[in-house]
């Protein structure tokens, strides 16, 4: 689809005459009729197949002509076309003189014919004017034309239709030959599909517009090249969408449980070595004088009761000092300077006097102790009850409260489940721990020996002097069959030969 | 042969929500060159473009009718759906699917035979 | 909002007669026309896109055209089986807009 335009520029007509010779009266009231149609090497009357225009009258005998495009388009002269511009053409221009107002042709004179002129050839189509003059003995025309596709029609023969658009089915304008030029960040045959923010993952990410990343489920971060781990993933990481890979030192399926407290929270204080025992459990082993769980507390030197004879500890900043009773001194209150005269034994101790009167001892009564038999003997502080057995202080003595499975005075005999003879066949019973074992004879099994199984009484060698063993299946016994000079039910005896 | 096979008709209470399909078959629902399309008509009525979906899940919709529908795309099983909700007897119609082609400047070239839609109380 | 009016409502004619159906929307020649066919109890059928062009299966008698302010389809020599409902389309940005339809129908 386009326009065949001519543009008509001058008519020269100086004698104001008609094709005839007869002058027009009173001068030749000149319009233009125009035929486009096919190539025709000679041009002929007929059809105008590419269509035809009139002008009204432009003026008389010799004029110039105006542009007119404000006017209905009267100059240049259009003649749309439908179809694929061929490249050749055949044009007709006649001018004619219109001696009243009606232009029909029906309405002219033959004779009012003023000049016709044909050309034909080759015309591309273009925004260049080509310039012609055609000159009769009578008159000239100049003249210009040109061929341009319609709107929204490209190429070289205004066949391509092409609408620019910027919408979903597509982004572009239309090149000169018809083709389609994208938008920016627009690519694809229809220009419909958006340019990714670069380096948006092809499977993982999309866009819906230019400079997107748009992540499919399952991945993130600017790129869409970040898997999504396992909802609650806590300490993991992940290499496809919802897996959850634990980082070092955390276990679970959240990667949850603290397989490493002592990394992750550092819990010993004061210097402790921690060593990790279990999921979020760990072990603080405190430096000398810390103490606690975490080895939080500093451990008092007054805790040990350092000071003897009744000497008061008090905690100083680099140790400990016993303040000592009248009559005591030294760095533990461990000197007296008291004698027996001075009844230091308390609870009904004996005094006894020691290096000639200088010093004494206190020989203390039973349930008592100390250098002054000050001290109450606590018969359990030494947890003389064996096996797990709990002590109790009884007055002057003390007695074990035994776990089950123990006995005797500090528990230290273990109670023979083996006592009733629980293995049958002549099993032999061994006490252990938590239960008995039975070691069964041969032919006998279970745990206690009452399952007969069969057995092949030869399997040990039972005979000598190379008899044949034989089983006596029914008994489970043997019978060796002996060689000559041997007797005894295992052929263990020779006898003499003559 | 590309063929677009909706789902069966709806009766619905006013309020309610619904949610028709439109199956492609002899094609895959996957390819660039076709955007995937819901038309409304009402008893004796004309056409209504209501939105499309291109198969990356991209959607367009007509304003008037934004608040109303959510249109989805299942790749794996080449099926493209409508979901309409808060109903009102203003809904009631006949709900085509089609195939909207690039290649023909976004017309309608392949057409379900239509889902009739009814909201009653 | 856009609007595409389509005239007349109704057109009524004779088996061969030559009709024309006309669409109309601001700048209407600078989109793609498409038009549709929608017999009786049928689904919309594709009978002209961009303009002019006719997808396969469409008969010849059926053409387009499309500038200025109008389109129009032209059936150039109508049967019966024409007879049906006829509606033309265009996209405004993103979105698709159909005219009111025109009603084919016999004398």
């Known amino acids: 689809s386009g326009v065949f335009q001519l543009q008509l520029q001058e008519f020269i007509n100086e004698r104001g005459v008609l094709a005839s010779g007869r002058p027009c009266e009173p001068g030749c009231r000149t319009f233009f009729r125009v035929c486009l149609k096919h190539f025709q090497a000679v041009v002929s009357p007929g059809p105008c197949t590419f269509g035809t225009v009139s002008t009204p009258v432009l003026g008389t005998n010799s004029f110039a002509v105006r542009d007119d495009s404000s006017g209905g388009g009267r100059n240049p002269l259009q003649l749309p076309f439908n179809f694929t511009w061929p490249g050749t053409f055949s044009l007709i221009i006649e001018a004619w003189h219109a001696p009243g107002d009606d232009l029909r042709p029906e309405a002219l004179p033959p004779d009012a014919l003023i000049s016709k002129i044909a050309i034909q050839g080759s015309l591309a189509v273009g925004q260049n004017w080509l310039l012609d003059e055609q000159t009769s003995t009578l008159t000239r025309l100049r003249y210009s034309y040109r061929v341009i596709c319609s709107d929204n029609y490209y190429g070289d023969n205004c066949s391509r239709l092409c609408k620019k658009r910027n919408d979903h089915f597509g982004h572009y304008v239309c090149q000169p030959d018809g083709n389609l030029s994208c938008l920016p960040g627009w690519t694809g045959e229809y220009c419909q599909q958006p340019i990714c923010l670069s380096g948006c993952h092809e499977q993982n990410g999309y866009c819906s517009k230019p400079a997107e990343c748009l992540c499919r489920p399952g991945w993130q971060g600017r790129l869409c090249n970040e898997c999504i781990p396992h909802n609650g993933c806590r300490h993991g990481t992940c290499s496809t969408p919802w897996q959850c890979t634990c980082d070092e030192g955390w276990g679970g399926l959240f990667c949850d449980q603290d397989l490493n407290y002592c990394t992750h929270h550092s819990p010993c204080k004061n210097g402790a070595t921690c060593s990790n025992s279990g999921q979020r459990s760990y072990t603080c082993t405190c430096r000398p004088g810390y103490t606690g769980v975490d080895c939080e507390l500093e451990l008092s030197e007054c805790d040990s009761n350092p000071c003897r004879n009744g000497g008061s500890c008090k905690d100083q900043e680099d140790g400990y000092h016993c303040l000592c009773p009248p009559g005591y001194y030294g760095l533990h209150c461990e000197h007296s300077t008291l004698s027996c005269a001075d009844s230091p034994c308390f609870n009904g101790g004996s005094c006894r006097e020691r290096n000639q009167g200088a010093n004494y001892a206190c020989e203390c009564p039973p349930n008592f102790t100390g250098s002054n038999c000050e001290k109450k003997v606590d018969r359990c502080t030494s947890n003389p009850c064996a096996n797990g057995g709990q002590c109790l202080n009884r007055g002057p003595s003390r007695m074990c409260r035994c776990r089950p499975g123990f006995t005797g005075t500090y528990c230290e005999l273990h109670v023979s489940d083996c006592a009733r003879n629980p293995c049958a066949h002549g099993g032999t019973c061994h006490d252990l721990e938590n239960g008995l074992m039975c070691t069964c004879p041969a032919g006998f099994s279970g745990r206690r020996c009452e399952v007969r199984t069969s057995i092949d009484a030869c399997a040990s060698s039972p005979c000598f002097n190379r008899a044949t063993c034989y089983t006596d299946l029914s008994t489970d016994t043997f019978v060796c069959n002996c060689p000559y000079g041997f007797v005894g039910s295992r052929c263990e005896f020779p006898v003499g030969l003559p | 042969q590309v063929q677009l096979q909706q789902s069966g008709a709806e009766l619905m209470k006013p309020g309610a929500s619904v949610k028709l399909s439109c199956k492609v078959t002899?094609?895959?629902?996957?390819?660039?060159?076709?955007?995937w399309g819901w038309i409304k008509q009402r008893p004796g009525h004309g056409l209504e473009w209501i939105g499309d979906?291109?198969?990356?899940?991209?959607?367009y919709y007509n304003p008037s009718l934004k608040s109303k529908v959510t249109i989805t795309v299942d790749t794996s099983s080449n099926t493209f759906y409508i979901q309409l909700i808060s109903l009102t007897t203003e809904d009631s119609a006949i709900y085509y699917c089609?195939?909207?082609?690039?290649?023909?400047?976004?017309?309608?070239?392949?057409w379900g035979q239509g889902t009739l839609l009814t909201v009653s109380a | 909002d856009y609007l595409l009016t389509q005239s007349p409502a109704i057109l009524s004619v004779s088996p061969g007669e030559r009709v024309s159906f006309s669409c109309s929307g601001q700048?209407?020649?600078?989109?793609?026309a498409s038009w549709y066919q929608q017999r009786t109890n049928g689904s919309p059928r594709l009978v002209i896109y961009?303009?002019?062009k006719r997808p396969s299966g469409i008969p010849s008698r059926f053409s387009g055209g499309n500038s200025g302010d109008d389109a129009t389809l032209s059936i150039n020599s109508v049967e019966s089986e024409d007879i049906a409902d006829y509606y033309c389309?265009?996209?405004?940005?993103?979105?698709?807009?159909f005219g009111a339809g025109t009603k084919l129908e016999l004398k």
């Open positions: 002899g094609g895959s629902i996957s390819s660039s060159s076709y955007y």
């Open positions: 961009e303009d002019s």
């Open positions: 700048r209407l020649g600078d989109k793609y």
């Open positions: 979906i291109y198969y990356t899940g991209s959607t």
């Open positions: 389309q265009a996209w405004d940005r993103d979105t698709g807009v």
């Open positions: 089609a195939r909207q082609a690039l290649a023909m400047g976004g017309g309608s070239d392949k």
